[in-house]
């Protein structure tokens, strides 16, 4: 079974994207991974756990060029999602230099909500996004990004933060989720699998893909992050899902190139400006979006979320380039930082369009299982 | 809101020692033991460079110039960042700042060091 690329959704043709023929169910990264000997039991198996927020961040988007992905994730296969019962845990471990719990990590002990009680939040970050049970809901418009093509200079702060690769971006990158919805852009970051491993946060249909990235927002309600915690739509995050492409991303490939600088844990260096919508899909209306949670602790809940329904792709080298180079904590390998999916405990998905239509002619009337709730709102 | 402020600076000969204490007040309870601390510093005419940080993983980095002689450390009950400095030489003479940087970047106002006989 293949995951078909559809030629209607590449902006440019050609490049990577509008593959006709589906890629085989072999090359589906697995779900069943096997467990590291560090790691503990899954999340599922903590108790109190089932309820956690999540977080994240990472904003910005434009047109993208040859070298995006057109993979629309309605188009994915159906798969089982079987619990995430090996991946990385919400645990945190105790900093070596004294009591301090808040050094947590991905896989260890304790458990986050040690480190921050709202980590057994109920509205938790990443989920599971199925597309047949998202809520069509119309008034979803385009995003809208402004002051996302950056000059070369001032140059920009990356860093080896022992949990991802962050890019501290400046003031001015404005960002609309509609009309009031105004936030500015704060930095981005990635998350990632381990070598024939997947690692983004998000799934959909049970489906992992090898990366993801996450460009955080902050509401221009606030003045600082610290405001905005835990406040409804005080933070808002843009994710988009990594995938395989045959050919080189020139975008990615501006901060690809300079991780050797920064393996070493708490390791910074400066980056040239870059036009930073071109990390990201090229289409801006096609996205599915729901309240959630920082993915990692302090675990804040309140967070919009938005996730692209087109993919980005690099190159197989690429992907390698980002699992295969920084290191982490206690001289291990920084990999497989992502936090295992959470329940969605009555929250509904919305869709900027259709995805939950089925169009085949099996379908004699389609059905959208959830309505959109915020008309307008 | 988070703000920070650095004390201890000073004049000191080479060869001394001085200890730079960075307190966050506010809103820091809800984000300094979730960020990543650091001390930066800035002599005039260069731009501002990286002197030594502890992630949000907990791990530590100094840059090489300062190696062996300056350690870092924080105190999330009291929400403070500390620089012990040791050795000091007059290429250390600078602004030093401290960083407090969980989803975006918070900066103290700085404190003067300057090592000279």
């Known amino acids: 079974q293949r995951l078909p690329r559809m030629q209607e959704d590449s902006p440019l043709g050609g490049g990577s994207s509008g593959e006709d023929d589906p890629l085989g169910e072999e090359d589906l990264p697995s779900e069943e991974d096997s467990p590291r000997e560090e790691d503990p039991p899954g999340e599922e198996d903590l108790p109190g756990e089932e309820d956690l927020p999540g977080e994240e961040d990472l904003p910005e988007v434009k047109p993208k060029s040859e070298e995006e992905g057109s993979l629309k994730l309605e188009d994915l296969p159906t798969v089982e999602a079987p619990g995430d019962p090996q991946e990385p845990q919400n645990n945190a471990h105790r900093d070596k230099e004294g009591d301090d719990q808040s050094h947590w990590r991905y896989g260890g002990d304790p458990p986050w909500p040690r480190v921050s009680p709202a980590c057994a939040g109920r509205f938790q970050s990443p989920v599971d996004i199925r597309p047949q049970l998202a809520a069509f809901c119309p008034a979803l418009r385009p995003l809208e990004l402004l002051g996302f093509q950056l000059p070369p200079l001032p140059e920009l702060r990356l860093r080896n933060n022992g949990h991802s690769v962050q890019l501290t971006l400046p003031p001015g990158l404005e960002m609309a989720l509609g009309p009031g919805r105004e936030y500015r852009a704060l930095q981005l970051h990635l998350h990632w699998g381990a070598a024939g491993r997947p690692g983004s946060e998000h799934t959909v249909e049970g489906h992992r893909f090898p990366a993801e990235i996450h460009v955080v927002h902050l509401s221009t309600a606030f003045a600082r992050v610290d405001e905005a915690l835990g406040r409804p739509g005080g933070l808002a995050v843009l994710a988009a899902f990594l995938e395989e492409g045959p050919e080189e991303n020139s975008a990615y490939e501006q901060l690809l190139s300079r991780l050797e600088e920064i393996a070493e844990e708490g390791s910074e260096t400066q980056v040239p400006g870059l036009d930073i919508s071109a990390l990201l899909p090229s289409d801006f209306s096609r996205y599915f979006q729901y309240e959630g949670s920082l993915t990692t602790p302090p675990c804040a809940q309140g967070v919009i979320w938005t996730v692209f329904n087109q993919t980005v792709m690099l190159s197989a080298k690429q992907l390698h380039t980002l699992s295969d180079t920084l290191w982490g904590p206690g001289d291990s390998r920084l990999q497989l930082n992502f936090r295992a999916t959470q329940p969605l405990n009555g929250r509904v998905i919305e869709a900027s369009f259709p995805a939950g239509v089925d169009s085949s002619p099996r379908a004699a009337e389609p059905v959208q299982l959830n309505s959109c709730l915020a008309a307008g709102d | 809101q988070v703000q920070l402020q650095e004390s201890g600076g000073g004049l000191v000969q080479p060869g001394g020692s001085l200890r730079l204490s960075c307190a966050a007040s506010g809103n820091s309870a809800n984000i300094f033991s979730f960020a990543s601390v650091a001390w930066y510093r800035q002599a005039p005419g260069k731009q501002r460079e990286l002197v030594a940080v502890i992630t949000s993983a907990g791990g530590t980095k100094y840059s090489d110039s300062v190696k062996g002689r300056f350690t870092i450390s924080r105190d999330n009950a009291k929400n403070t960042i500390l620089l012990q400095m040791n050795s000091l030489k007059p290429e250390d003479t600078a602004v030093y700042y401290c960083?407090?940087?969980?989803?975006?970047?918070?900066w103290g106002q700085g404190t003067q060091v300057t090592v000279s006989s």
């Open positions: 960083n407090v940087d969980y989803l975006q970047d918070y």
